[in-house]
């Protein structure tokens, strides 16, 4: 997990200022109002590995 301004979060995650860490975009299904979910809308999801 990276601090903002150094490197982006890994694919499928987005930076949360509230929690001070990268958070899973998948959690936006249950918690759409989380601060980091705005960043998820612009980023592609992590690919499935079937």
């Amino acid at each position: 997990e990276q601090a903002p301004g150094t490197a982006p979060c890994s694919r499928g995650s987005s930076w949360s200022a509230d929690l001070d860490k990268c958070m899973d975009c998948a959690s936006c299904r249950a918690r759409a109002h989380s601060d980091f979910c705005l960043g998820c809308a612009a980023a592609p999801p992590a690919p499935f590995r079937l």
């Epitope: 899973d24 299904r29 249950a30």
Partner: antibody, heavy 119, light 111 residues
Framework: EVKLQQSGGGLVQPGGSMKLSCVAS????????MNWVRQSPEQGLEWIAE??????????HYAESVKGRFTISRDDSKNSVYLQMNNLRPEDTGIYYC??????????WGQGTTLTVSS | DTVLTQSPASLVVSLGQRATISCRAS??????????IHWYQQKPGQPPKFLIK???NRDSGVPARFSGSGSGTDFTLNIHPVEEDDTAIYYC?????????FGAGTKLELQ
């Protein structure tokens, strides 16, 4: 370091009551949904209760098996979550864990506390 | 409620070999983007330890020997190569809806 420190538990007679407590440290408690999960040889791992956030007036959810008998509550000022258990039954016997989740997975668990309901 | 069925109930594997654990959901627990299945490891006298989230994403600090896959209703946890320390019970859990339920567990033992 994330820590969930549990207290309470012990032996109680059928029909009796017990309150479990869990104090959290090392993470932003008020942002996390707090849960109780119990484990027994008969039922395996069984989620029993969850309390969500102040911003939504602390909504709660319960397993059908404990609805109306158990009450989950939290005190964000004390980083604590509680489980008040009333009208206890022998089938409530097990190890009780508090666990936190942001939305989906239980990433941190307490050490567990044993409840025995027996006469 | 979504029921998770794990198989096998127990598994004996030789050191260095592959352990494969299956978790089948009674309904789909995937969207087009994510699968809402998570894996845990539990050793005697300890609480479950979170291993893998969203079917395939390892938690930080979890060795690359652990991998998860699957979507829809069928999911797999693979451990390869198996090490001594991997002796434990492994559980899957879904977060598709309330209640979140767990599989009955798979006990992994070393030969």
């Amino acid at each position: 370091e994330v820590k969930l420190q549990q207290s309470g538990g012990g032996l109680v007679q059928p029909g009796g009551s017990m309150k479990l407590s869990c104090v959290a440290s090392g993470f932003t408690f008020s942002y996390y949904w707090m849960n109780w999960v119990r484990q027994s040889p008969e039922q395996g791992l069984e989620w029993i209760a969850e309390i969500r956030l102040q911003s939504n007036d602390y909504p709660t959810h319960y397993a059908e098996s404990v609805k109306g008998r158990f009450t989950i509550s939290r005190d964000d000022s004390k980083n604590s979550v509680y489980l008040q258990m009333n009208n206890l039954r022998p089938e409530d016997t097990g190890i009780y864990y508090c666990a936190c989740r942001y939305a989906d997975y239980f990433d941190h668990w307490g050490q567990g506390t044993t409840l025995t309901v027996s006469s | 409620d979504t029921v998770l069925t794990q198989s096998p109930a127990s598994l004996v594997v030789s050191l260095g070999q592959r352990a494969t654990i299956s978790c089948r959901a009674s309904q789909s627990v995937s969207t087009s983007d994510y699968s809402y299945i998570h894996w845990y490891q539990q050793k005697p006298g300890q609480p479950p330890k979170f291993l893998i989230k969203y079917a395939s994403n390892r938690d930080s600090g979890v060795p690359a020997r652990f991998s998860g896959s699957g979507s829809g209703t069928d999911f797999t946890l693979n451990i390869h190569p198996v090490e001594e320390d991997d002796t434990a019970i492994y559980y899957c859990q879904h977060s598709w809806e309330i209640p979140p339920t767990f599989g009955a567990g798979t006990k992994l033992e070393l030969q």
